[in-house]
Amino acid sequence: AVNGTSRFTCFYNSRANISCVWSQDGALQDTSCQVHAWPDRRRWNQTCELLPVSQASWACNLILGTPDSQKLTAVDIVTLRVMCREGVRWRMMAIQDFKPFENLRLMAPISLQVVHVETHRCNISWKISQASHYFERHLEFEARTLSPGHTWEEAPLMTLKQKQEWICLETLTPDTQYEFQVRVKPLQGEFTTWSPWSQPLAFRTKPAALGKD
């Protein structure tokens, strides 16, 4: 159960959650593994049970407090260990000194809504969720619009290089159904990555007035 290529990756959501994924080729599906968290300057220790998410990968969330509580800072280091049971003993499979603000992945944006829609344009707003006040305005967004007959993967990415929680989509086709998604990323952190995409927001442009284009 320990011979395959392994990978251990964790991200901090900037508030009170560290999410980890442990993957190992050739590991048995019923292998019992945990993530242990040992901070350098906090009184708590945390453990979470790694649960299977696919044939060779397991995931768990270290819940450090209430969703909007600020549990870690940029000077914290949390040693994270993957421990797997082998018979009667536990074996360490991976270890890292985790710097939370070097490994950020925020929650997906929420509360997407259509502020105003016309025949050729649509104004959409959203909110960020459980994001640290430490970022102030140092966030960027990516957005994409799903047009009829296309896939999300084909949708061109629109980049907002500042903390702007709205967008005005233009050059849309009248009386057409669209979907919209957005994701967020802090500017801080060597290993920081994009949040998951938001839930899609469906909207329809207004039909063109009779006798007009």
């Epitope: 990978r7 074996r91 499979m93 991976a94 270890i95 890292q96 000194d97 490994n103």
Partner: nanobody
Framework: QVQLVESGGGLVQPGGSLRLSCAAS????????MSWVRQAPGKGLEWVSS????????YYAESVKGRFTISRDNDKNTLYLQMNSLKPEDTAVYYC???????????????????RGQGTRVTVSS
């Protein structure tokens, strides 16, 4: 680009001590696990020791456990290997190595080594 420059090697008698240093540049040193590997004359690369990014976890090959100590100074971007009670079989070129992430995998300690230096030669002989 990543640069790793080892120093501190030399000729030492059996039972003696040496301290190797590795000056790192071109990356955020404290974000990465680091290790020492060695290559004895006519042999392949052998993993010696590893340390996590903040130095909270240290790991050793059985052949050096209790004699060698790995450490790091993140303010100086420097990795160290203190070698005591040296034996003739410790004779090798010692390389400082950087992992490809902050993660170290104890069951497969050489996994993920991405860069290494030019090496410093250690000879243990009377």
């Amino acid at each position: 680009q990543v640069q790793l420059v080892e120093s501190g090697g030399g000729l030492v008698q059996p039972g003696g001590s040496l301290r190797l240093s590795c000056a790192a540049s071109g990356f955020t040193f404290s974000n990465y696990a680091m290790s020492w590997v060695r290559q004895a004359p006519g042999k392949g690369l052998e993993w010696v020791s590893s340390i996590t990014g903040a130095g909270r976890g240290t790991y050793y090959a059985e052949s050096v456990k209790g004699r060698f100590t790995i450490s790091r100074d993140n303010d100086k971007n420097t990795l160290y290997l203190q070698m005591n009670s040296l034996k003739p079989e410790d004779t090798a070129v010692y390389y400082c190595a950087k992992y490809d992430s902050s993660t170290f995998y104890p069951p497969t300690p050489a996994r993920g080594i991405a860069d290494r230096g030019q090496g410093t030669r250690v000879t243990v002989s009377s």
